[in-house]
Amino acid sequence: IWELKKDVYVVELDWYPDAPGEMVVLTCDTPEEDGITWTLDQSSEVLGSGKTLTIQVKEFGDAGQYTCHKGGEVLSHSLLLLHKKEDGIWSTDILKDQKEPKNKTFLRCEAKNYSGRFTCWWLTTISTDLTFSVKSSRGSSDPQGVTCGAATLSAERVRGDNKEYEYSVECQEDSACPAAEESLPIEVMVDAVHKLKYENYTSSFFIRDIIKPDPPKNLQLKPLKNSRQVEVSWEYPDTWSTPHSYFSLTFCVQVQGKSKREKKDRVFTDKTSATVICRKNASISVRAQDRYYSSSWSEWASVPCS
Amino acid sequence: RAVPGGSSPAWTQCQQLSQKLCTLAWSAHPLVGHMDLREEGDEETTNDVPHIQCGDGCDPQGLRDNSQFCLQRIHQGLIFYEKLLGSDIFTGEPSLLPDSPVGQLHASLLGLSQLLQPEGHHWETQQIPSLSPSQPWQRLLLRFKILRSLQAFVAVAARVFAHGAATLSP
């Protein structure tokens, strides 16, 4: 058993049929010695008396808020949560496996630049009695500070018969060094509590591996005289690291017909303009990627050819 | 060339070669971001590689003030990785293909280090750890880790030379 926060404790249980469970001793936080009784949740049934209560925790019915009283007055509370381990693996019932980039990916994180700011998100089908708390650091043995905000519900989607909820959190490295080569990864730890179930999820990454620039901005077309060609121009997104002579992007320009089946013409360039042939009813799209490190491409910025 | 006394390197040549290094490093081990860092095990060899750190002067301001600190750091790293890529970790089984990008990477690391340091002047270099796994699969995993860390190193070096070529070239 360990303390998650004040008066909240996590009991780690091997979860299998007829498992013996864990013996837990609760102590009433009071100078009083006599006349103390214990109850669980809203029940008035007295579970025991005395300053300590020994219980065998085997299942969710044994978890909950234990309260010690004296003469009708509440002295203190201890909330017991369960953390299940099945076949040596901690349960992951609360969050949905996003399966991208690979199986068992529960947390996904992205950064728009090298400033040390990043966003992580996760999915669940649970709508109520759910809380999250997020901690982060750079490195684990001698951790350096990363400050995370509160996790918030950022999107709701209907997936078949189910509703899916997306939560996200923003974090900022306290002393970020955008130009340095990272040697210690960022660690992100999410504590999830649903009713009386506790789970924790972790992710470990370098900022450079989660970079995804915003799409290029101010995408414009300039027709070239007496030609089907157009000059496409764009700018670096505002959110990208500066100076651009140091933090450079590379771009992919795509001409795509109305039908998805039509062949796409693609050009790669380090410049912020390109000359392409504009077909009728086609659109021109541009996306960006770090020039020197193959992290994710941005989403496309698009304009119609006409 | 980054010679003692602080004359400038051939920024544009260094830029071109460092950008080629980036391409080669990614070709040698293309899908890197998907490796889970916690599954990799802390291997001494990749912990001991020289990193371009915050105080090394490789940021735009540091380069403007005095690019020598940064260039020396980059040179150290280039020599270190050049030695690693020529070591038994890469020459042992499983053999590399004769036209392997690792071979070209090795040659390009040497080429860039020579652009930075003319013969006759020697910056301090770091010893490479003598750790060669006996099993081919261990060697393979170590190769991937080294290439992964090289990708990060050459990305910073390429930024330095691109910025130098754009703002510090005579």
Partner: nanobody
């Protein structure tokens, strides 16, 4: 970000031929070794063939040696698998993937860190 797209699969009679293509976008194939793999219904994925970055060096699984030929055209960013004398046991979904140093097809490595295409179905049946 490498994207690989296979094409050329289909239904063919035993003894017939097919030519599969693997086109890359998002990255130049110039320095990349590329492998072909296949997965028959209810079976694991197996290495079929691999070609080095220049196209000079090739590897084949014993089961396809002498019947399949791998080649590449770096100017088109495409790798090909010419399949002749096809047999019913060649029926499978065929995938192309990045395979540094052809480690995977050579049997040294079975990790999950490569780029894979979506696959193209080859059915050999009379």
């Amino acid at each position: 970000e490498v994207q690989l797209l296979e094409s050329g699969g289909g239904l063919v009679q035993p003894g017939g031929s097919l030519r599969l293509s693997c086109a890359a976008s998002g990255f130049t194939l110039d320095y990349l070794a590329i492998g072909w793999f296949r997965q028959a219904p209810g079976k694991g994925r197996e290495g079929v063939s691999c070609v080095s970055s220049s196209g000079q060096y090739t590897y084949y699984a014993d089961s396809v040696k002498g019947r399949f030929t791998i080649s590449r055209d770096n100017s088109k960013n495409t790798v090909y698998l010419q399949m002749n004398s096809l047999r019913p046991e060649d029926t499978a979904v065929y995938y192309c993937a990045t395979d540094p140093e052809c480690y995977r097809v050579r049997g040294y490595y079975n990790g999950e860190y490569d780029y894979w295409g979506q696959g193209t179905l080859v059915t050999v049946s009379s």
